[in-house]
Structure formats: C-alpha cells, structure tokens
C-alpha cells in the first residue's frame, strides 16, 4: 500500500490522543533505554510502511502484536485516514486470522514495540518543514 | 537515565566561529530529534535549529540559517552546533534538549548548557 | 513566524495564592483538535523544565496544582497555591510550526 495520500495530520492526532497511551501500557515495566532503536525511516508515507510492517506482519520471535489494542487502533486510523487502505488489508487479516495462536509478550515483541516507539515519534516529528 | 552533557564555556572574538557539543548518555541516540536552544542573558528562549541523527535531516530558524550548522556523529551519540560570523549579540547560554519519547515534541531532557561570550 | 506573546511580563503572588500566566500564539497552534502549546518552568542557572505538553498534560513528576488550559491561540498556566520553590521564569512554546517559539517569559515572585 502507499501511504502517500493518508492524512497524516490525522494519524497523528490519533495516534497522540490513544495509540501512544496503549504502547505505553504494552511496554510497562521496561525501562525505555533497555532497547536500541535501529530501525528507522525518512518521511511520512516511509514511516506508515514500517509502521505497518512491524506492527501486523510475524516476525520470528513475535507474532503476536496484531491484536493488541495499540495495532487494532493503529488499523482503524490506517483505515479511516487512508484512502483505499482497508480495502487492501482484507486478506492480509483473513491470513492472520488463521495463524493467530495465543497471545504472549516476549522479550522480542518488547522490542519490537521499542521500535515502534521510535517509528512513530519520527513520523510525528519530521524535520520537513525547513524555512 | 538520559543525560546531555555539553562542552565548556567558550570566548570568541568577533567574525569568528564557535562549535558546541552534545554528548547524549544513557539512551538511543538516533531515533530522537536534537535541538538547540540559546538564552542570551537576562532574556528569553531561543531556538535555533535541530536534527535527526537517524538520517542527518536539519531544521534550521532562518534567523540563524546562513550561519548555523548542526550535525550529528551516531557513533559517539554527540550532535554539534556551529555558528559562524560571530558578533557580540550571539553571547549567550547554548542549550541542546532532546524530544520526549512519544513525538510529543516537548524537550524532555536537556544539556547544561555552554557559555558561549563574544568579545573583542 | 508564529509569535507568543506572554502577559504579564512579571508577577508577584503571595504563598498559597493562585498564580495565573497567559499566552497568546499570534495565529492558531491547534491541528487536528490537539493544541500543539507547552509549558516549562526556568530557575536561576538552570536550563528549562517542562511542566504542561499539549496545552493541557501535566508532565512527568509535575505537581498537581500546576495546571495548563486553552485552544487555537490563547493558552492559560495556573499555579492553585503558590509554593516558594515555584519563583521562577515561565516561558510558553509553540510547536506546530517551524520555526518553533517561545513567549519571552513570565517572571514570577512571591509578594
């Protein structure tokens, strides 16, 4: 999918407003320095696609992100604020759907949140603005 | 615990140019917006510019732009501040403050800032 | 350049009395129904210290009687019951639009 046309203004407010509180919730009791952020990404649309990544496609080590309240909310901001975007998704989620097995936060979704975190304070703060 | 420890107070005369670092402890470095601050004295708030480390990308004040250039050094966790064609209205305190952790974009962790005094 | 305008310049309260700091954005600071304004608090020799993030959030380990209201471009901080570790100059900041600003402080001392 391409994020060029999402209304990132948008996004962010949602993001800002429940998003954040609810990564903050799953990363409880991790101090924010104990991972190393190493993914990153260099505008808006580029964000939105590893945000997307991370958040709903397995990983070895952590599978078990797309359920969680964060990605459900971080989906329905994608949905709502992306033009075409749900229509995409729909096998993509039935897949998942399948897999899904039990929920269990591992060290590695842990850190996969971490990165999360940094995505998505990149995507609110770009440095795009320049006078 | 994140810290930003600065360089130390400089004197520069005037037409000259200064370079201020900032040395980040304790946290990740790259993913964070930098940005620098200056206070000349008794006054208020200024801000100059910033960067991404991540990629590099800056932000300048266009007050500043002609003259001021910030870099970043990944590999020691240090940005920079340069500011060139020094005059005596550019003393002041320089200050580099990191973003808070959730693009908020408030400065939650701040250097101690450098004394930076122009004089002839 | 969005510019803040902070009144009053300076303000002597007594202890235990409300302390009352306005900011005015020269357009709105407001995207999205967030208002993109912050607080900090600045004593003597000491770089800034956040206090309110988006207009109205109390920052970490800030006391409750700090509190942060407004929306668009006119923004209030309210200190409930002044303390003496409260003197200190306040400055109000902008972040919607590059270049970021600040208010040019508020000066406030015990009467």
């Known amino acids: 999918y391409d994020f060029t046309n999402c209304d990132f203004e948008k996004i962010k407010a949602a993001y800002l407003s429940t998003i954040s509180k609810d990564l903050i919730t799953y990363m409880s009791g991790t101090k924010s320095t104990e991972f190393n952020n190493t993914v990153s990404c260099s505008n808006r649309p580029h964000c939105l696609t590893e945000i997307q990544s991370l958040t709903f496609n397995p990983t070895a080590g952590c599978a078990s992100l797309a359920k969680e309240m964060f990605a459900m909310k971080t989906k329905a901001a994608l949905a709502i604020w992306c033009p075409g975007y749900s229509e995409t998704q729909i096998n993509a989620t039935q897949a998942m759907k399948k897999r899904r097995k039990r929920k269990v936060t591992t060290n590695k979704c842990l850190e996969q949140v971490s990165q999360l975190q940094g995505l998505w304070r990149r995507f609110n703060r770009p440095l795009l603005k320049q006078q | 615990e994140v810290q930003l420890v600065q360089s130390g107070a400089e004197v520069k005369k005037p037409g000259s140019s200064v370079k201020v670092s900032c040395k980040a402890s304790?946290?990740?470095?790259?993913?964070?917006?930098m940005h620098w601050v200056r206070q000349a004295p008794g006054q208020g708030l200024e801000w100059m510019g910033a960067i991404y480390p991540g990629n590099g990308e800056t932000s300048y004040n266009q007050k500043f732009k002609d003259r001021v250039t910030i870099t970043a050094d990944k590999s020691t966790s240090t940005a920079y501040m340069e500011l060139s064609s020094l005059r005596s209205e550019d003393t002041a305190v320089y200050y580099c403050?990191?973003?808070?952790?959730?693009?908020?974009?408030?400065?939650?962790?701040w250097g101690q800032g450098t004394t930076v005094t122009v004089s002839s | 350049d969005i510019v803040m305008t902070q009144s009053p310049d300076s303000l002597a309260v007594s202890l235990g009395e409300r302390a009352t700091i306005n900011c005015r954005a020269s357009e709105s600071v407001d995207n999205s129904g967030l208002s993109f304004m912050h607080w900090y608090q600045q004593k003597p020799g000491q770089p800034p210290k956040l206090l309110i993030y988006r207009a109205s959030n109390l920052g970490s380990g800030v006391p409750d009687r700090f509190s942060g209201s407004g929306s668009g471009t006119d923004f209030t901080l309210t200190i409930s019951s002044l303390q003496a570790e409260d003197v200190a100059v306040y400055y109000c900041?902008?972040?919607?639009?590059?270049?970021?600003?600040f208010g040019q402080g508020t000066k406030l001392e015990i009467k």
């Open positions: 403050a990191r973003e808070d952790d959730y693009g908020e974009g408030y400065f939650d962790v």
């Open positions: 304790g946290g990740t470095f790259s993913t964070y917006n």
């Open positions: 900041q902008q972040i919607n639009t590059d270049p970021l600003t």
